[in-house]
């Protein structure tokens, strides 16, 4: 009678939207990688449903993923990076839906820190600083960087700038004065990987110096 | 209808070097892995090396870890295979392979003849 009752289930399940999409991230944690899926429809019931990632893999066939509340997580040295790979949602035994992906095509960066804006005086600049833990990396070194500030009265009103190192210069005459200012950044790879931004670094808030009214120059 | 095309195999003589390349007409050639496979006389088929799309990353067999270099240019659809150091147990027929797909190589080219005299 039970098997009667999961097949109905295994029925209803075939007619539910399962597309997923994933992220890898490259020694995430020292040598480890990992790779995370997630239900594009966050109204699918995943009670019963796997996700399973087969091929390009060292040492092993396949590797499931952990269940963390409602995404799919992999931590593990075992991605080869070189190939394609058969990633599937799964009941039991049975794929629903399958996607086969290149690791190294749908990678996301660790957000950028440890950002700071210094004003300096002698050059009417700000000097814009920020530290990334992809330096230090085997993999994904060559990132860009996107860096987006605003003033905090404008709600969408953002200024991007684009660049590959972790240093820029914004000169005082493009700011309002005696204004309050948001900046963060992001990054995605921009060599030999492809994929997706990063989460935005923490915001950082500045202040730019009022104008003197002598000179019409800000202070 | 050729689709790999292996050249730079031929005699020489235990010590030194020789550059294999492979010619890819398939035009995913930018977004697929390559490998390279070689067969000793009377033996199975042994792969090698292996390099990702971009070729950030490669991967070697223990037996030539340190005397073979894979690499590849993606403008000319070629793989190559940098052979230093060459011994005798070298020889063979030397196969590049495109796409790895799931642990299954989709495309073989017909091989080059490699010999090393002791």
């Known amino acids: 009678e039970s098997g009667y009752a999961q097949n109905g289930d295994l029925e209803d399940a075939e007619l539910d939207d399962y597309s997923f999409s994933c992220y890898s991230q490259l020694e995430v944690n020292g040598s480890q990688h990992s790779l995370t899926c997630a239900f594009e429809d966050p109204d699918v019931n995943t009670t019963n449903l796997e996700f399973e990632i087969c091929g390009a893999l060292v040492e092993v066939k396949c590797l499931n993923f952990r269940k963390l509340q409602e995404i799919y997580f992999i931590e593990t040295k075992k991605f080869l990076l070189i190939g394609k790979s058969n990633i599937c949602v799964k009941v039991g035994e049975k794929s629903l839906t399958c996607k086969k992906i290149d690791l190294t095509t749908i990678v996301k960066p660790e957000a950028p820190f440890d950002l700071s804006v210094i004003y300096r005086e002698g050059a009417n600049d700000f000097v814009v600083t920020f530290n990334t833990s992809h330096l230090q990396k085997k993999y994904v070194k060559v990132l860009m960087h996107d860096v987006a500030y605003r003033q905090e009265k404008d709600e969408n009103k953002w200024t991007h700038v684009n660049l590959s190192s972790t240093k820029l210069t914004l000169l005082q005459r493009k700011l309002q004065p005696a204004a309050m200012y948001e900046i963060k950044v992001r990054s995605i790879p921009d060599h030999y990987f492809k994929g997706f931004w990063s989460e935005w670094s923490p915001s950082y808030y500045f202040r730019t110096p009022e104008i003197n009214n002598s000179s019409g120059e800000m202070d | 209808e050729v689709q790999l095309v292996e050249s730079g195999g031929g005699l020489v003589q235990a010590g030194g070097s020789l550059r294999l390349s492979c010619e890819s007409s398939i035009s995913t050639f930018s977004s697929d892995a390559m490998g390279w496979f070689r067969q000793a006389p009377g033996k199975g088929l042994e792969w090698l090396a292996a390099?990702?799309?971009?070729?950030?990353?490669?991967h070697y067999s223990d037996s030539v870890k340190g005397r073979f270099t894979i690499s590849r240019d993606n403008a000319k659809n070629t793989v190559y295979l940098q052979m230093n150091s060459l011994k005798a147990e070298d020889t063979g027929r030397y196969y590049c392979?495109?796409?790895?797909?799931?642990?299954?190589?989709?495309?073989w080219g017909q091989g080059t003849q490699v010999t090393v005299s002791s």
């Open positions: 390099i990702g799309w971009s070729g950030a990353v490669t």
């Open positions: 392979a495109e796409d790895y797909d799931t642990d299954v190589w989709q495309y």
